[in-house]
């Protein structure tokens, strides 16, 4: 049994890091493998992650971590029984994939303005809380070409757009994702999408 593709990990910079790797053949990850991880810090304890299958030869493990900060570095040991298959390290702050925003809501009752709001996925005491920026994707269910991205580079988790910038009388969907420049993160996954019917009063023409 050998590792074909070494583990690569990403952290949500809060409580979970996800590591994925591939074996050289079909593997029952949960029964044959264990990923041990330990913070390089005084008094830290070793933890064991039981991987799940991710395709025939692929494995994925969700590592639970407390109080993740930029100074943290973890040792990783991948074991098959008594055999050490791979040894490495992982610094969560250098491989951050933020959590997806939640609670995306479209408020349509504000005088021909659409107000989209969502929730920051981090608590206020997490460093990323004040450093997320967002991308909002709006698209028409009827017209695949009617697809747009709005970049929200301010901290407030909201976006206002004129309803008239979208077609009236049809349904739209929106979703939002986040990233943080400070840690050069990847984009988060998209939030679940929300749907609304866009209707507004056309301006009266003389």
């Amino acid at each position: 049994m050998k590792v074909l593709q070494e583990p690569t990990c990403v952290s949500d910079y809060m409580s979970i890091s996800t590591c994925e790797w591939k074996m050289n053949g079909p593997t029952n990850c949960s029964t044959e493998l264990r990923l041990l991880y330990q913070l390089v810090f005084l008094l830290s304890e070793a933890h064991t992650c039981i991987p799940e299958n991710n395709g025939g030869a692929g494995c994925v493990c969700h590592l639970l971590m407390d109080d993740v900060v930029s100074a943290d570095n973890y040792t990783l040991d991948l074991w098959a029984g008594q055999q050490l298959l791979w040894k490495g390290s992982f610094k969560p702050s250098e491989h951050v994939k933020p959590r997806a925003p939640g609670n995306l809501t479209v408020h349509t009752n504000v005088s021909d303005t659409l107000l989209l709001t969502w929730s920051n996925p981090y608590p206020p005491d997490n460093y990323l809380y004040n450093h997320l920026t967002y991308a909002v994707n709006i698209w028409s269910e009827n017209d695949p070409a009617d697809f747009r991205i709005y970049n929200v580079t301010y901290l407030e988790p909201s976006l206002r757009i004129a309803a008239s910038t979208l077609k009236s009388g049809i349904s739209y969907r929106a979703r939002v994702r986040a990233w943080a420049q400070c840690y050069n993160t990847t984009w988060s996954e998209w939030s679940p999408s929300t749907k609304w019917h866009n209707s507004y009063r056309e301006p009266f023409e003389q």
Epitope: L42, L43, E45, D66, D67, V69, S70
Partner: antibody
């Protein structure tokens, strides 16, 4: 919000022991290390040791080895610092502080006076 | 005796900028992360800067930190009378076993 509530001031005789408590609330107690530091009157901060509330393991500054004991009670989210063989130079304010590489939150401090 | 050396005192007028230095060595600041703590008179220390230059939420951007080699600096701009306090740098000594260190402390007086 996070709170670290420490026990009240103590007056002790030289040679005695003192046990200071620090009750934590507002966060997952076993997820954060707890440090103890002290500050003698008009002096700077001095680190004493650290406890991992999850397993109860400890590490102490060399200066206090053999005299200090840090424990925790997960049922009450409380950590304790006991200092024995007290001498006059142990008169100080003793602080508990939550954190790992740096100390996010501090208790208000407990004044321990050692006097004959 | 702390191996992190700070000036005993600094002073400046309201609105001015002041810097506080923290000098260490390769086994501490040079190989670890620096934090800064503010201790107002009669109160417990409060985290001001961590990870060399990051501010916890609620700390105004008048406070900033930097690190270069084996030294670190805390800068305070737009000084206010409420900033009058003792300031301590902190880091880890990477000897075995590792242990945290505090600086000697600096008393800031706002004239």
């Amino acid at each position: 919000q996070v709170q670290l509530v420490q026990s009240g001031a103590e007056v002790k005789k030289p040679g005695a022991s003192v046990k200071v408590s620090c009750k934590a609330s507002g966060y997952a107690f076993t997820s954060y290390y707890m440090h103890w530091a002290r500050q003698a009157p008009g002096q700077g901060l001095e680190w004493m040791g650290i406890i991992n509330p999850s397993g109860g393991s400890t590490s102490y500054a060399q200066k206090f080895q053999g005299r200090v004991t840090m424990t925790r009670d997960t049922s009450t989210s409380t950590v304790y610092m006991e200092l024995s063989s007290l001498r006059s130079e142990d008169t100080a304010v003793y602080y508990c502080a939550r954190g790992k590489w740096w100390l996010y939150n501090w208790g208000k401090g407990t004044l321990v006076t050692v006097s004959s | 005796q702390s191996v992190l050396t700070q000036p005993p005192s600094v002073s400046a007028a309201p609105g001015q900028k002041v810097t506080i230095s923290c000098s260490g060595g390769s086994s501490n600041i040079g190989n670890s992360y620096v934090s800064w703590y503010q201790q107002l008179p009669g109160t417990a220390p409060k985290l001001l800067i961590y990870d060399n230059n990051k501010r916890p939420s609620g700390i105004p951007d008048r406070f900033s930190g930097s690190k270069s080699g084996t030294s670190a600096t805390l800068a305070i701009t737009g000084l206010q009378t409420g900033d009058e306090a003792d300031y301590y740098c902190g880091t880890w000594d990477t000897s075995q076993p590792p242990n945290p260190l505090f600086g000697t402390g600096t008393k800031l007086t706002v004239l």
